[in-house]
């Protein structure tokens, strides 16, 4: 039978992949050299556990999930991912002056196990 | 409660200055950038640029460079949209908003002020 | 001319669902974000839908957006005679940073 994407964590609350918000500013992120605002970034990232079938992206991830039950030398665990991410603006220096850039790929929204 | 409170309505004649204002309430003034957005009468919503209050960076429209200034005082929580010289085509409503936490989107806006030039 | 395209007008009567679309181009809504405004009669407008399909807390469930492409959509569900407005779309173009969509007028019907 095909293995459910399961939500529920075996680890314990807050164990397994999930969202975790971690506050940064630009120096911290190596970024003050390039962009001026915001000075301090939400950083949202999927941190956490992917134990069996838990929130598996897709068949790969349940394959593999079983396949590293069966050969944890040779096969990893699936990874905590983004499974989408929410877009940013940042204000940046430039040559001339300073201009305006959005990043579709900086924060992520949910988690997932691939 | 988060609250942006624009100035009063004006009425200028062409040529003459003005400066409208936009002050925040209920959140960190800096944290957030403000925008100016126009709205000419029965007509849609246009960009014209934001300011990061913390630091005072600015970036205005193309369509706007040059035409009208954008500033704030940090100590009182207050942006300003300026003019040095009116035309009748600025005749619009003109409204601040301030930006969510990343930047993409408006969240919160304030009344309108609007602008009437006219000899 | 706007760099997003709307609708002018859609009308529908109470309970109907309406759907108000957005068409930009592949250096705006086609790699971005897309969010809608709506704007009652004589007030600001006040934000509806965020980063393509996210309500702010005090939205109703009524409102949904999608995006799909180079295309977005607000839909509407349950119509009541208070959803009558103007509703804006708004992205982000290569060009000209924050773009709006000329507006789209809503009448409830009846």
């Known amino acids: 039978a095909r293995a459910r994407n399961g939500d529920h964590c075996p680890l314990g609350p807050g164990r397994c992949c999930r969202l975790h918000t971690v506050r940064a500013s630009l120096e911290d992120l190596g970024w003050a050299d390039w962009v001026l605002s915001p000075r301090e970034v939400q950083v949202t990232m999927c941190i956490g556990a992917c134990p069996s079938q838990f929130r598996a992206a897709n068949m790969h991830a349940q394959i593999k999930t079983s396949l590293h039950r069966l050969k944890p030398d040779t096969v990893p665990a699936p990874c905590c991912v983004p499974a989408s991410y929410n877009p940013m603006v940042l204000i940046q220096k430039t040559r001339t002056g300073v201009s305006l850039q959005t990043y579709d790929d900086l924060l992520a929204k949910d988690c997932h196990c691939i | 409660e988060v609250q942006l409170v624009q100035s009063g309505a004006e009425v200028k004649k062409p040529g003459e200055s003005l400066k409208i204002s936009c002050k925040g309430s209920?959140?960190?003034?800096?944290?957030?950038?403000i925008g100016w957005v126009r709205q000419m009468p029965g007509k849609g919503l246009e960009w014209m640029g934001v300011i990061d209050p913390g630091g005072s960076y600015t970036i205005y429209s193309p369509s706007f460079q040059g035409q009208v200034t954008i500033s704030a005082d940090k100590s009182i929580s207050t942006a300003y949209l300026q003019w040095s010289s009116l035309k009748a085509s600025d005749t619009a409503m003109y409204y601040c908003?301030?930006?969510?936490?990343?930047?993409?989107?408006?969240?919160?806006w304030g009344q309108g002020t609007l602008v009437t030039v006219s000899s | 001319q706007s760099v997003l395209t709307q609708p002018p007008s859609v009308s529908g009567a109470p309970g109907q669902r309406v759907t108000i679309s957005c068409s930009g181009s592949s250096s705006n809504i086609g790699v971005l974000y897309v969010n809608w405004y709506q704007q009652l009669p004589g007030t600001a407008p006040k934000l509806l839908i965020y980063s393509n399909d996210n309500r702010p807390s005090g939205v109703p469930d009524r409102f949904s957006g999608s995006k799909s492409g180079t295309s977005a959509s607000l839909a509407i569900t349950g119509l009541q005679a208070e959803d009558e407005a103007d509703y804006y779309c708004?992205?982000?173009?290569?060009?000209?940073?924050?773009?709006f969509g000329g507006g789209t007028k809503l009448t409830v019907l009846g």
């Open positions: 209920g959140y960190s003034f800096t944290s957030y950038w």
């Open positions: 708004q992205s982000w173009d290569s060009s000209s940073n924050y773009v």
């Open positions: 908003a301030r930006y969510g936490r990343y930047g993409t989107y408006f969240d919160y």
